[in-house]
């Protein structure tokens, strides 16, 4: 369980400036080599399952909660950054 770094604090901290998280292009998608040794790292659910989850922001998967969190672009808020802040 996340301690004080709750989902909203995560958003506020990380959404103070527009995010530009790199996402693999279509050719790379599905061909990416697994990092590390042995089984390798699991794919980020934000790149597939939750790809379009965040409307006006970027997806960050919170492993402790087994859920996506949206890092909202400036001026937006809410679960999926739907809301334009007045």
């Amino acid at each position: 369980d996340l301690q004080e770094a709750d989902l909203d604090l995560l958003r506020v901290t990380l959404s103070s400036k527009p995010q530009a998280l790199a996402t693999p292009n279509k050719e790379e998608h599905g061909k990416r080599k697994k990092k590390g040794k042995g089984l390798g790292k699991k794919r980020d659910p934000c790149l597939r399952k939750y790809k379009d989850f965040c409307i006006h922001g970027e997806c960050k998967y919170v492993k402790e909660l087994r859920a996506p969190s949206c890092i909202c672009h400036p001026g937006y808020h809410g679960e999926r950054c739907h809301g334009l802040s007045l």
């Epitope: 709750d6 989902l7 989850f53 409307i55 087994r66 859920a67 809410g78 739907h82």
Partner: antibody, heavy 118, light 113 residues
Framework: EVQLQQSGPELVKPGASVKISCKAS????????MHWVKQSPEKRLEWIGE????????TYNQKFKAKATLTVDKSSSTAYMQLKSLTSEDSAVYYC???????????WGQGTLVTVSA | DIVMTQSPSSLSVSAGDKVTMSCKSS????????????LAWYQQKPWQPPKLLIY???TRESGVPDRFTGSGSGTDFTLTISSVQAEDLAVYYC?????????FGTGTKLEIK
């Protein structure tokens, strides 16, 4: 399996308040916001608002800001909605709902019928 | 608020018929950043909560029969049932899934002759 279990039907008098509950199971309660939707007798659906179960932070539909109050009890994984100053216009079925990986409301409670009558 | 207008309000068809229903939004539901339309369709059978059928205007939710097809972009959307079955008797709602407050259409009631 994600489940949202709502409290039973309520018969309340005009001017009174009512508090309905939605108990979540099958997922991490604090990982997803809880939403509430009203369905009037004419079957019209209206989004009331949402609450972040971790922080208690809410976003309301302006229309329901003075009518509904959303709260949660993390210890029991239960979301609540209180409706105040009830009138016949508030007679409806109220649903709690949760988004899925696709975004829209994938998981719904069974609904709570609230009837306002003298 | 975004207003969702559905038509027709009701339809009476025979099993096996093809059905189309319309949903128009007062503002575009297309996100220019990712070129996705944030429009959902729900089916509500009597005495049940709504069930998600289509999201992103055209993507079927897992387990939804392929006779249900969503199409459209921007402000004009369509739900098509290629061959209506008796169990499709329900009210169908579209939903603005793009911005607060979320808004639903008034619904199209599908009746089977």
């Amino acid at each position: 399996e994600v489940q949202l279990q709502q409290s039973g039907p309520e018969l309340v008098k005009p001017g009174a308040s009512v508090k309905i509950s939605c108990k979540a199971s099958g997922y991490s309660f604090t990982g997803y916001y809880m939403h509430w939707v009203k369905q009037s007798p004419e079957k019209r659906l209206e989004w009331i608002g949402e609450i972040n179960p971790r922080t208690g932070i809410t976003t309301y539909n302006q229309k329901f800001k003075a009518k509904a109050t959303l709260t949660v009890d993390k210890s029991s994984s239960t979301a609540y909605m209180q409706l105040k100053s009830l009138t016949s216009e508030d007679s409806a079925v109220y649903y709690c709902a949760r988004v899925g990986s696709s975004g829209p409301f994938t998981y719904w409670g069974q609904g709570t019928l609230v009837t306002v009558s003298a | 608020d975004i207003v969702m207008t559905q038509s027709p309000s009701s339809l009476s068809v025979s099993a096996g018929d093809k059905v189309t229903m319309s949903c128009k939004s007062s503002q575009s539901l297309l996100n220019s950043r990712n070129q996705k339309n944030y429009l959902a369709w729900y089916q509500q059978k009597p005495w049940q909560p709504p069930k998600l059928l289509i999201y992103g205007a055209s993507t079927r939710e897992s387990g939804v029969p392929d006779r249900f097809t969503g199409s459209g972009s921007g402000t004009d959307f369509t739900l098509t049932i290629s061959s209506v079955q008796a169990e499709d008797l329900a009210v169908y709602y579209c939903q603005n899934d793009y911005s607060y407050p979320f808004t639903f259409g008034t619904g199209t009631k599908l009746e089977i002759k």
